[in-house]
């Protein structure tokens, strides 16, 4: 029944988000008759590919085809057969592949080449696989949430209940947390963006936007944890690391070779007198928070103000949508409500981290231990990043909205990417180069 011709005149598009920890495929749909050349796209399907991110296939590229099969077959089922040939497929790889490219451009190219060959075997209109820049990732995330919130257009939309804005046109900032990088993107208030690398100018729906964006490579939650472990093992007196970011009673053996595998830990690398060490959780939020803060260099700033590591950050302005891992982690911790104050979040994190590992395992029996064990670190990291990294305060905390989906579409960079690549962001093209896509022929 899925493949019956649809009475409505619609088009489809597919975007694969090849992240550092996993790959997700998104199917988008929009009416063929576009309102004023501005299509209205929404997500009809998300398929999470089983397995790790594509960068992990560097030694087994022959397995990439099988890895992508299930989700590509799902796309075949969801999209009517008559539309297959005209449905574009794009794959964007993010920070996991940026890190692999830093290690070896040749290996990164080999992975992308096999991905491209695999995706070309399907009956869709494959448009290419590429590593998107951190700047693009931030910009497209910002476009996605503001598009879905109706911040760009005052038109009534074609599906269900959708934005017809009467005022309220202030855009939301975007906070995106992945496994290997994190992005902050917003429109500053009458503030010069002092660093050209962080400035984007574009015109959307007849309005000019001067947008600040930065992507912090190695500051996604997984790579931040590797960084913290590499930093802390430097001062450990033996092969036992008593770690405040894990629950009391938690134990895990880590290979030193795995620790130093990522470029993110290079700055902490040293010759250790052991090949393995054991993490022993002590579950102390305050100490965990202090350890995390050591990852942020706030002693140097060549601008009027900085986030950390000498990166310019204008004063925060307006509301922010925090999505991806910001949302997943805070949802697990039951801390996504707008009225949960920053003080209350901190209090709850203190209690959560102090809970014994055996108790935690019993309370969350359905959750994989690998993920479960890291929520104390991840929650503490999110607080540290937002408060000390980006300078949110107890007062401005209430302007952070933890968002999973808006109008049924995932908050994230893929929808913005789709909007741009299908030319459904108005004919007046964005002025900034990262959004121009000259890569595609």
């Amino acid at each position: 029944t899925q493949n019956k011709a649809l009475p409505e005149n619609v088009k489809y598009g597919i975007v694969l988000d090849a992240g550092s920890s996993h790959t997700s495929l998104y199917i988008y749909k929009w009416p063929a008759e576009k309102e004023n050349d501005t299509g209205v796209v929404h997500q009809v399907e998300e398929c999470r590919v089983k397995g790790p991110g594509i960068s992990k296939f560097v030694q087994k590229v022959n397995e990439i085809g099988i890895y992508l099969t299930d989700c590509m077959e799902r796309a075949r089922e969801v999209i009517p057969r008559s539309q297959h040939q005209e449905t574009p497929v794009y794959l964007g790889a993010t920070a996991g592949m940026r890190l692999l490219r830093m290690e070896s451009e040749e290996l990164a190219d080999r992975v992308l080449d096999v991905v491209e060959r695999s995706l070309s075997n399907y009956p869709f209109d494959f448009q290419g696989a590429r590593i998107i820049t951190g700047q693009e990732e931030g910009a497209y995330g910002w476009i996605t949430i503001n598009y879905l919130l109706g911040k760009f257009s005052q038109k009534t939309r074609w599906f269900s209940i959708v934005p017809y804005e009467t005022n309220n046109q202030e855009t939301f900032g975007a906070l995106d947390l992945g496994g290997a990088s994190t992005q902050v993107t917003f429109v500053p208030q009458n503030q010069t963006i002092e660093s050209p690398d962080n400035a984007l100018q574009f015109r959307l729906y007849g309005k000019d936007y001067n947008v600040y964006t930065h992507s912090f490579l190695c500051y996604g939650k997984d790579q931040a944890l590797w960084q913290k472990l590499a930093k802390d093992i430097q001062v450990a007196s033996n092969e036992i690391l008593r770690d405040p970011c894990f629950h009391p009673g938690y134990k895990k053996v880590v290979n030193v070779s795995d620790l130093y595998k990522t470029p993110c830990t290079k700055r902490f690398e040293m010759t250790l007198p052991f090949q393995q060490f054991e993490i022993q959780g002590i579950g102390n939020y305050q100490q965990c928070h202090q350890s995390i803060l050591e990852l942020f260099n706030t002693s140097y700033c060549p601008y009027s103000q900085c986030a950390f590591n000498g990166i310019f950050l204008p004063p925060l302005q307006g509301d922010f949508g925090a999505f991806s891992a910001f949302y997943f982690v805070m949802k697990f911790l039951n801390l996504t409500s707008e009225k949960v104050s920053q003080e209350k979040v901190t209090e709850m994190m203190k209690k959560f981290c102090a809970q014994p590992w055996e108790e935690i395992k019993t309370s969350y029996a359905g959750v994989k231990e690998k993920y479960l064990s890291e929520y104390c670190f991840s929650g503490t990291y999110i607080l540290s990043l937002l408060l000390q990294g980006y300078h949110f305060t107890a007062d401005s905390w209430e302007h952070i909205h933890f968002i999973g989906k808006i109008q049924g579409s995932d908050a994230g960079w893929t929808l913005g990417y789709m909007l741009n690549l299908t030319n459904m962001i108005p004919a007046e093209q964005p002025l900034s180069t990262p959004l121009s896509h000259s890569t595609y022929v």
Partner: antibody, heavy 118, light 108 residues
Framework: PVQLQQPGAEVVMPGASVKLSCKAS????????MNWMRQRPGQGLEWIGE????????NSNQRFKGKATLTVDKSSSTAYMQLSSLTSEDSAVYFC???????????WGTGTSVTVSS | EIVLTQSPTTMTSSPGEKITFTCSAS???????LHWYQQKPGFSPKLLIY???NLASGVPTRFSGSGSGTSYSLTIGTMEAEDVATYYC?????????FGGGTKLEIK
């Protein structure tokens, strides 16, 4: 069209349980939270709780803890609310409604009238 | 929990008149989390305005919303006979989600 279908009425005995259903159509069921509301005769609306069909995560109004249990069946795009240990106080119309960011309810079911009577 | 107080409980108006319903919150709410519904007797509630000022699909433009902090309002620019109903405000800012007690609009 986006629709939430609910049975019209249920009559149940005091002390018994009832499982109310809400069948979704016209949209991707797992992409929106499902909420449940109660409206007693001639009264206003009370929020009971919500469930995310993608991962079965729930939030409930403490007032209904132990009274209402929310579940979903992804394969049939149906949300359920089980009400237990019913008393005459539970006689009301129960609505399901789809939730979106900002926690507003954009699509409502037709409502199921529950009468608790012996 | 956040208590929403709507006033008045009942109001009587004539077609063509401008009407304003108010909703007062017991603590401050971010405007993204305040919404309005219309319910006619024997029917399900219907979303009118979401996130303070956004008109839901299919809702006539005579309806508008505004407000911030603890004070919000719904306005009908020119009342029509079909607007006879009960109007509820609702907050999604914190758990539990709560509704105001409603304002019943009657026709003169």
């Amino acid at each position: 069209p986006v629709q939430l279908q609910q049975p019209g009425a249920e009559v149940v005995m005091p002390g018994a349980s009832v499982k109310l259903s809400c069948k979704a159509s016209g949209y991707t069921f797992t992409s929106f939270w499902m909420n449940w509301m109660r409206q007693r005769p001639g009264q206003g609306l009370e929020w009971i709780g919500e469930i995310d069909p993608s991962d079965f995560y729930t939030n409930s109004n403490q007032r209904f803890k132990g009274k209402a249990t929310l579940t979903v069946d992804k394969s049939s795009s149906t949300a359920y609310m089980q009400l237990s240990s019913l008393t005459s106080e539970d006689s009301a119309v129960y609505f399901c409604a789809r939730g979106d960011f900002g926690w507003y309810f954009d699509v409502w079911g037709t409502g199921t009238s529950v009468t608790v009577s012996s | 929990e956040i208590v929403l107080t709507q006033s008045p409980t009942t109001m009587t108006s004539s077609p063509g008149e401008k009407i304003t319903f108010t909703c007062s919150a017991s603590s401050s709410i971010n405007s993204n989390y305040l919404h309005w519904y219309q319910q006619k007797p024997g029917f399900s509630p219907k979303l009118l305005i979401y996130r303070t000022s956004n008109l839901a699909s299919g809702v006539p433009t005579r309806f508008s919303g505004s407000g911030s902090g603890t004070s919000y309002s719904l306005t009908i620019g020119t009342m029509e006979a079909e607007d006879v109903a009960t109007y509820y405000c609702q907050q999604g800012s914190s758990l539990p989600r709560t509704f105001g007690g409603g304002t019943k609009l009657e026709i003169k």
